[in-house]
């Protein structure tokens, strides 16, 4: 069941999921100057069964200038640079290789994808928070939020995290210290 709203906002923090539960939608958003092709789903869907899950539908962006120059998903290395891919992101994607039954990994980027990924999460999804670069995490408890169903309504638990001061960003679960992370978490790996 789809969560009614988005995970809580924490000042100076971003969040991401390590894996996405079946039923999760990822909107096919394109960067400025590009738009989603007119045929095809407006989102990708994490779908499958208990043994194997994958993203259904593929996002494709085309130039807003009338010419129909649609290109297929996987971007070239120079285009990946344009999407501010950092070493930290690739470390996260390695962490995502761990297969959880009934979950999908982070989908690969598509060409001319928007800088921010917009997910519609489902009940039971956990997202993990970290402070953006330049802010230090003060933990009063777990820096995570879970979408729960209570009395027929969905709600996100409040992450016990405050981001303050000057220091390196903290990490998501199961990740090693990155060698270099000039940008911290790329925007494309977050949702507001």
């Amino acid at each position: 069941e789809l969560c009614d709203d988005d995970p809580p906002k924490i000042t100076h923090a971003t969040f991401k999921a390590v894996a996405y539960k079946e039923g999760t939608m990822l909107n096919c958003e394109c960067k400025r100057g590009f738009r989603r092709i007119k045929s095809g789903s407006p989102y990708m869907l994490c779908t499958g069964n208990s043994s194997h899950s994958s993203w259904d539908n593929q996002c494709q962006c085309t130039s807003s200038a009338a010419r129909n120059t649609t290109k297929q998903v996987t971007p070239q290395p120079e285009e990946q640079k344009e999407r501010k891919t950092t070493e930290m992101q690739s470390q996260m994607q390695l962490a995502d290789q761990v297969s959880l039954p009934g979950h999908c990994r982070e989908p690969p980027p598509w060409e001319n994808e928007a800088t921010e990924r917009i997910y519609h999460f489902v009940v039971g999804q956990t997202v993990y928070y970290q402070c953006v670069q330049g802010y230090r995490a003060l933990h009063r408890g777990p820096a995570e939020s879970v979408c729960k169903m209570t009395h027929g309504k969905t709600r996100w638990t409040q992450p016990q995290l405050i981001c303050t001061g000057e220091t390196e960003p903290s990490q998501f679960p199961g990740e090693e210290e990155p060698q270099a992370s000039p940008d911290g978490l790329p925007e494309s790996e977050t949702s507001r």
């Epitope: 007119k38 789903s41 989102y43 921010e116």
Partner: antibody, heavy 114, light 107 residues
């Protein structure tokens, strides 16, 4: 709590135009497309088009090109639809919808009558 | 444009029964189909997305199925509050289109 609050009922003259609003609350307005849907008794639901408030991209159903115009004001998280050259065929309830059609406004009834 | 046909405009059922509302697309739409419930004087309420996934708060007696061109919304153990009109919608390609609706009447 995510809400789409639409403006009130309109009674308008044929040949004039009308502008209705849809105010979003409880989510990041610029992240999600806002769609508009027309409902007339006996005609079911008709998708008019949608607008992305973040980049002001629009898509229009061919049947409504020249009839409907979408705009968005990010400062007030409000989307507008203007309908022009109104005729009795435009008398209907108009709904706004967002978050991949999960959320719907309460509808704005429009009556075109002389 | 893709045409969605809900062949039954009216369906009559009794409380506790099981009823299936069907929707046929004029071309393949994958699983990019949603179902809505509309009660008199209200705006449509989203029930199902991607053919078979329920929105939050939707009772599990509502089940969606199908892919390609044939889709079904099944209501098991029908309740009196299910009296409403049910619409299918495709969002596989622009313009998005809706079925003509099926009115569920409770005997």
């Amino acid at each position: 709590q995510i809400q789409l609050q639409q403006s009130g009922a309109e009674l308008v003259r044929p040949g004039t135009s009308v502008k209705m609003s849809c105010k979003a609350a409880g989510y990041t307005f610029t992240n999600y497309w806002i769609g508009w849907v027309k409902q007339r008794p006996g005609h079911g639901l008709e998708w008019i088009g949608d607008i992305h408030p973040g980049g002001s991209y629009t898509n229009y159903n061919e049947n409504f090109k020249g009839k409907a115009t979408f705009t968005a004001d990010t400062s007030s998280s409000t989307t507008y639809m203007q309908l022009s050259s109104l005729t009795s065929e435009d008398s209907a309830i108009y709904f706004c919808t967002s978050r991949n059609f999960a959320k719907w406004g309460q509808g704005t009834p429009v009556t075109v009558s002389s | 444009d893709i045409v969605l046909t809900q062949s039954q405009k009216f369906m009559s059922t009794s409380v506790g029964d099981r009823v299936s509302v069907t929707c046929k697309a004029s071309q393949n739409v994958g699983t990019n189909v949603a179902w809505y419930q509309q009660k008199p004087g209200q705006s449509p309420k989203a029930l199902i997305y991607s053919a078979s996934y329920r929105y939050s708060g939707v009772p599990d007696r509502f089940t969606g199925s199908g892919s390609g061109t044939d889709f079904t919304l099944t209501i098991s153990n029908v309740q009196s509050e299910d009296l409403a009109e049910y619409f299918c919608q495709q969002y596989n390609s622009y313009p998005y289109t809706f079925g003509g609706g099926t009115k569920l009447e409770i005997k």
